[in-house]
Interface confidence: low
Amino acid sequence: TIPPHVQKSVNNDMIVTDNNGAVKFPQLCKFCDVRFSTCDNQKSCMSNCSITSICEKPQEVCVAVWRKNDENITLETVCHDPKLPYHDFILEDAASPKCIMKEKKKPGETFFMCSCSSDECNDNIIFSEEYNTSNPDLLLVIFQ
């Protein structure tokens, strides 16, 4: 990825266009890879990632992955090409302007993933309000 302070630009050998033929510029995303998180049982969370990167490729979108197991909670923020699977899952919501978390089946952990295509959209991850954790083992308000 390109450092955050670098201006958006397009190399001639990397020009990508959207469906309307307009030039598609690389996107800005939060990119902290995997970090421990205190995001638990909330309707939405900020990533608390201080690194904003320009995605390497114009077609890449922002991705966030939230995982909870018996030991810890992590939040992963990256850029990724939606044509390629991530953690063995297709990025179905890559065109969404918001990062709406969807639960994926992973043995031994609770696993949510979202993708989105507006700048820094993976900074605010949104969980469905209807979702209830299957193991309500602690009161959010105490351990936020």
């Epitope: 049982n41 909330q42 309707k43 209807e130 954790t133 308000v141 351990f143």
Partner: antibody
Framework: QVQLVESGGGLVQPGGSLRLSCAVS????????MSWVRQAPGKGLEWVSA????????ANTDSVKGRFSISRDNSKNTLYLQMNSLRAEDTAVYFC??????????????WGQGTLVTVSS | DIQMTQSPSSLSASVGDRVTITCRAS??????LNWYQQKPGKAPKLLIY???SLQSGVPSRFSGSGSGTDFTLTISSLQPEDFATYYC?????????FGQGTKVEIK
Amino acid sequence: QVQLVESGGGLVQPGGSLRLSCAVSGFEFRRYAMSWVRQAPGKGLEWVSAISAGGDRTANTDSVKGRFSISRDNSKNTLYLQMNSLRAEDTAVYFCAKGTAARGKNYFDPWGQGTLVTVSS
Amino acid sequence: DIQMTQSPSSLSASVGDRVTITCRASQSISSYLNWYQQKPGKAPKLLIYAASSLQSGVPSRFSGSGSGTDFTLTISSLQPEDFATYYCQQSYSTPPTFGQGTKVEIK
């Protein structure tokens, strides 16, 4: 049915110590965070301490930090509150309460009947 | 800490009356707001969680509404057993904080 029964309250002098217990039955104690909430005579409710299901995480309100310690014994289905360096302002009925957390759904329910702690010389 | 302010502090009403209690948070708490009922010498009882969800076993005359900073508990038709003190509580951030309570008395 679900029951939370507090004990250990009583009269203690300022600077003294007490240990409260909360015996739990009717639900899978080890799966839930637990809290202590107190109520001074004629006053409102104040959250005091909480502990995670596994007992590895605790939190306290500022006014009791360094003086009160919450713990639990999941094999005995019992919650504890060790209270040291007690002050007159700690005088209250102390309730234990089960914590429930899910997305958008975080509350104390049910509660025990409470035990009265009086700090006075 | 988030401050919770209830109004009124007390009110007098008759059986059958519609009663409304309001709760204001010092900052936005989304829908992380619970309501409890407490009778003298008894433990608090959960009525409403997540601002508007009725706890199992609570009569449907109790309802809650609001989001952000302003919330309301409504008793559509006051019954004799409803005379009690009502508390709101935010569960948005640590520490969880309660309103000062609203005492509903018989007129």
